[in-house]
């Protein structure tokens, strides 16, 4: 579990001068966070989500301090990089530096792989992750995105069971779900989520979230989201925040109804949806007649099934 690269709290921690009361308070909070993080390595993954929630809470607190700390940013980012390298070296348990490690598409980007397409991420024995084929978006908004979901052809059904959503399904070159276990591992460090959508009229929209975490299987791959930015109208994923993942054979929603069976997908169903990005793909002509389609209520409402969707993630501290 790697939550070390948490950019904002790390800066006040290093600021030795100007010990105003707020900075002292923040230092105490960050110190508390550090102890929690070291304890996290020894604890079972069951405890992980509660720590993430505290991280997110601290993040919101520290953001209030951000304007006072901008002058020190360049000095401390260099120190942060050194700390990151040490932590990654420890995680690798071999002599290679963090620059050599490839965790996701952002790592590949930093190693000058700048062409979007399919890449193989090497296995990581320390993190327990096998070799993984991923599709990297190296262009959008600076690049470095690992795509975790795509809907474009409609040939692959997303009405799948828990095991398939866990392991992943579909073709990495076409429509696919990367797999909750893989997404969970990729979101162990502070991560951003970007959702891109296209309607049947060719309009493009996006939603981006400052923080994205997927819990582990013990926590039913629960979704945690930070702040929303974007141009897709209302935020239709916030309703699903802090909600467990459900599939047709595992009902973890907050409803008497079995949302996964009603909405015909696997998703973080609440009761049931403000969005349903893993819903049924409906083609033009059928796209505006169904409640179980690929929907984003804040844009086209509850019965408009989108033509194309991509969900992608990259580290919060990624710099193109």
């Amino acid at each position: 579990q790697k939550l070390s690269k948490h950019k904002t709290p790390a800066q006040p921690q290093l600021k030795a001068a100007n010990c105003c009361e707020e900075v002292k308070e923040l230092k105490a909070q960050v110190a508390n966070l550090s102890s929690l993080l070291s304890e996290l390595n020894k604890k079972q993954e069951r405890d992980w989500v509660s720590v993430v929630m505290q991280v997110m809470e601290l993040e919101s607190n520290s953001k209030r301090m951000e304007s006072r700390l901008t002058d020190a940013e360049s000095k401390y980012s260099e120190m942060n990089n050194q700390i990151d390298i040490m932590q990654l070296q420890a995680a690798q348990t071999v002599t290679q530096t963090s620059a050599d490690a490839i965790y996701d598409c952002s790592s590949l980007y930093q190693k000058n792989y700048r062409i979007s397409g399919v890449y193989k991420l090497p296995p990581d024995d320390f993190l327990g992750s096998p070799e993984l084929e991923v599709f990297c978006d190296m262009e959008t908004s600076g690049g470095g995105w690992t795509i975790i979901q795509r809907r474009k052809s409609g040939l692959v059904s997303f009405y799948r069971d828990w095991k398939q959503y866990k392991q992943g399904f579909g073709s990495i070159r076409g429509d696919f779900w990367l797999g909750n276990e893989h997404i969970h591992r990729l979101s162990r460090q502070p991560t951003r989520l970007r959702v891109e959508m296209e309607d049947w009229e060719g309009n493009l929209r996006y939603a981006e979230y400052s923080h994205f975490v997927l819990g582990n299987e013990l926590n039913s791959y629960r979704l945690f989201l930070g702040n929303y930015t974007g141009n897709v109208g209302n935020d239709a994923l916030q309703y699903h925040n802090n909600t467990a993942f459900s599939t047709k054979d595992k009902d973890n929603d907050n409803c008497l109804d079995k949302c996964a069976q009603l909405r015909k997908g696997g998703y973080w169903y609440n009761c049931c949806t403000d969005s349903n990005l893993n819903g049924v793909y409906y083609r033009l002509g059928e796209h505006n007649k169904h409640l179980d389609g690929i929907t984003w209520y804040g844009w086209h409402g509850s019965t408009y099934s989108l033509k194309r969707v991509e969900m992608k993630i990259r580290p919060e501290d990624f710099k193109p």
Partner: antibody, heavy 120, light 107 residues
Framework: QITLKESGPTLVKPTQTLTLTCTFS??????????VGWIRQPPGKALEWLAL???????QYSPSLKSRLTITKDTSKNQVVLTMTNMDPMDTATYYC????????????WGQGTLVTVSS | DIQMTQSPSSLSASVGDRVTITCRAS??????LNWYQQKPGKAPKLLIY???SLQSGVPSRFSGSGSGTDFILTISSLQPEDFATYYC?????????FGGGTKLEIK
Amino acid sequence: QITLKESGPTLVKPTQTLTLTCTFSGFSLSTSGVGVGWIRQPPGKALEWLALIYWNDDKQYSPSLKSRLTITKDTSKNQVVLTMTNMDPMDTATYYCAHNPDYGDFFDYWGQGTLVTVSS
Amino acid sequence: DIQMTQSPSSLSASVGDRVTITCRASQSISSYLNWYQQKPGKAPKLLIYAASSLQSGVPSRFSGSGSGTDFILTISSLQPEDFATYYCQQSFSTPLTFGGGTKLEIK
């Protein structure tokens, strides 16, 4: 070009275990999205899907036969093996293996099939 | 499980005829419907996938339509080699299920 071929016993006694091997060429079962399925057809009857194994070792089974079926793959040998326990005369059928493309759960290439008769 | 019902179960037609075979799903399956042709003693052959997409190498006289629960396979002008049994199959949800088949015979 994609080809598949089933092999295994043509005659099985009741209660015995059937082991069928599908040997394929022209594709790799390590390619994202790809799968190999087994389908059977009793004489003069319709097709019945049995099992499917994907590139990532995800295995799907017909619920009515799940307790009797096991599907495995050997990617390096380009083989998929189906075992079916406790065979019964009702299991007499032609057994096909087929290629499941990376873009959907259907079967675009089929083996020639092998007729398995269950009789004492 | 999703049940697939084909009609008719058998059909007599002549060369040059336009023929339609229907397939009905027990619940909505969007466009996740595929059609196969099988000749005696041979393996099935994929004709149409995703309700209306023609598989590579299949003659254009074959076409598929429909969405939701009702689907149609059309052969616009029957050829001698088209006399066979036709099966529909849903790929919306496991278990994957086939229809009972439609046997197309020479009148």
